[in-house]
């Protein structure tokens, strides 16, 4: 059941003004142009479904071409509160406020939104990425400093008549882009308020959002070239599985990663690849135009469906999980990095997965939809796919329940 025809009014049709409003590349993120303040200050903002803060550079930084100057905005309001966000590597910190925000190639509205003005950061901004801030599109539960800070999308929906849904089409280039090309290239589309049918082929298949914090979903089965990894499905979602446009790779829990690499190695065993390649520490190159895509297997993730005991699968090609990178020394070769990596925080379906699909974040109906992207990179023999239904029993058991750590668990 793809629910294709039962969309509410206002959800159907074309969003011409929003098509092609993203730029960037999977290794450095996809960004949308936004304006902040009065008069409007234009900034490029990373689209991140794996966080919930709208945060922008607000002080000079060697990697920033421009930054938000609060003192120049007549509509800026200081919330007199700081925010500190540490990452595994790096961090950003800043001052909270609100201001008027709009998206030039988005809906024709202006909203007052919370903004974290980043005053200090470490390993956060990326040299040459061309973005100056981050738009966290996930839910309030993971907003910093706490869930009382309303995320941008919540403010947008609350203050306008825009339906509570957005969709992303991230278009991987299939070849590395130098800075000039990256600025000129189309990166994809963020459709705010609905679904654009020109951006996908076939049907949309939906998986429930398990819990509204990250965009958490449940993976029920994993196959490499049709071979089941045969793991307890809880392992696939340990400790969660999320859809995250702000992450480059498909990241898998340690046990799953090891099993998947073993299976991918076996499937591509025509020639031994060094361990450093599978760990993402080495690049592999072929003479331009000769990449033997056929020796690499497809990867299929089965996601819980909307109906009891029903699942569907999304299948990506090596064209998605081998990420094109520039050759160190010469442009005569096509070089790639293995973009599946190990995670200690669960499965992360990052840009390498999303670049195969049009992904619908249907917040109103607490579900995420997948369809084959009209812009995915493929060859004449294989294409990314979204297929179903499949019968899968006991899918609820595949979800991992993270132990509570707050004081309430100590009460008897």
């Amino acid at each position: 059941e793809t629910d294709e025809e039962s969309e509410e009014p206002g959800r159907r049709g074309s969003f011409v003004e929003m098509v092609d409003n993203l730029r960037g590349k999977s290794g450095q993120g996809y960004y949308v142009e936004m304006t902040v303040g009065s008069p409007p200050q234009t900034l490029n903002i990373l689209v991140d479904t794996g966080s919930s803060n709208f945060a922008v550079g607000a002080a000079p930084h060697p990697f920033l071409h421009r930054y938000y100057q609060r003192q120049l905005s007549s509509t800026y309001r200081d919330l007199r509160k700081g925010v500190y966000v540490p990452y595994t590597q790096g961090k950003w910190e800043g001052e909270l406020g609100t201001d008027l925000v709009s998206i030039p190639h988005g809906p024709n509205v202006t909203v007052r939104a919370n903004i974290a003005a980043i005053t200090e950061s470490d390993k956060f901004f990326i040299n040459g990425s061309n973005w100056e801030g981050i738009l966290g599109l996930a839910y309030a539960e993971i907003a910093r400093p706490d869930d009382s800070l309303e995320p941008f999308f919540d403010s947008l929906v609350k203050q306008t008549h825009i339906p509570n849904i957005f969709s992303l089409q991230l278009c991987g280039a299939g070849f590395p882009l130098n800075q000039t090309e990256a600025l000129a290239s189309v990166g994809g589309s963020m459709i705010i308020g609905g679904i654009d049918h020109s951006l996908y082929t076939g049907s949309l298949w939906y998986t429930p959002i398990r819990r509204e914090w990250y965009y958490e979903v449940i993976i029920v089965r994993v196959e490499i070239n049709g071979q089941d990894l045969k793991m307890d499905c809880k392992e696939y979602n340990y400790d969660k599985s999320i859809v995250d446009s702000g992450t480059t790779n498909l990241r898998l829990p340690k046990k799953v990663f090891e099993a998947a690499v073993k299976s991918i190695k076996a499937a591509s065993s025509t020639e031994k690849f060094p361990d450093g390649f599978w760990l993402g520490e080495q690049l592999v190159c072929w003479q331009a135009g000769t990449t033997p895509w056929n020796i690499f297997p497809v990867i299929s993730l089965y996601l819980m469906g909307e109906v009891t005991n029903q699942s569907f699968r999304i299948t990506i090609l090596p064209q998605q999980y081998l990420r094109p990178v520039e050759d160190v020394a010469t442009s005569q070769d096509d070089c790639y990095k293995f973009a599946v990596s190990q995670s200690s925080t669960g499965t992360v379906m990052g840009a390498v997965i999303m670049e195969g699909f049009y992904v619908v974040f249907d917040r109103a109906r607490k579900r995420i939809g997948f369809a084959v992207s009209a812009c995915h990179v493929h060859d004449e023999f294989r294409t990314a796919a979204v297929e179903g239904p499949f019968v899968t029993a006991d899918m609820e058991d595949c979800g991992y329940n993270i132990p509570q750590t707050d004081e309430s668990t100590l009460m008897t």
Epitope: F273, G276, L283, V284, C285, W286, Q287, T330, C335
Partner: nanobody, 121 residues
């Protein structure tokens, strides 16, 4: 697996010299290209110099006439002799290797951890 061991970095006065070396582990198909690139804080990565297995060399314009790349094929080692150093040469220098094609035509690029070169005026 390809392992790279860099050495020779350090601090030096402008006009001074340093010699970087990078030893690579054995690889079945050998190395077709080795070299050095550098990255200064807040700057783009820059390819400094390369040498191919047949001895062909190339240099970025800013180091021509001052830096010399050489190799010892028997030891899978590449050297970068840096003379007349300038403050703008201050950067972390990374060794890289590119293997020759295997039976599938695949070549592998590896890089080291980097060695810091600081040139003061």
């Amino acid at each position: 697996d390809v392992q790279l061991q860099e050495s020779g970095g350090g601090s030096v006065q402008a006009g001074g010299s340093l010699r970087l070396s990078c030893a690579a582990s054995e690889y079945t198909y050998g190395y077709c290209s080795m070299g050095w690139y550098r990255q200064a804080p807040g700057k783009e990565r820059e390819l400094v110099s390369t040498i191919t297995s047949d001895g062909s060399t190339s240099y970025v314009d800013s180091v021509k006439g001052r830096f010399t790349i050489s190799q010892d094929n028997a030891k899978n080692t590449v050297y970068l002799q840096m003379n007349s150093l300038k403050p703008e040469d201050t950067a972390k220098y990374y060794c890289y290797t590119k293997t020759c094609a295997n039976k599938l035509g695949a070549k592998f690029i590896s890089w080291g951890q980097g060695t810091q070169v600081t040139v003061s005026s």
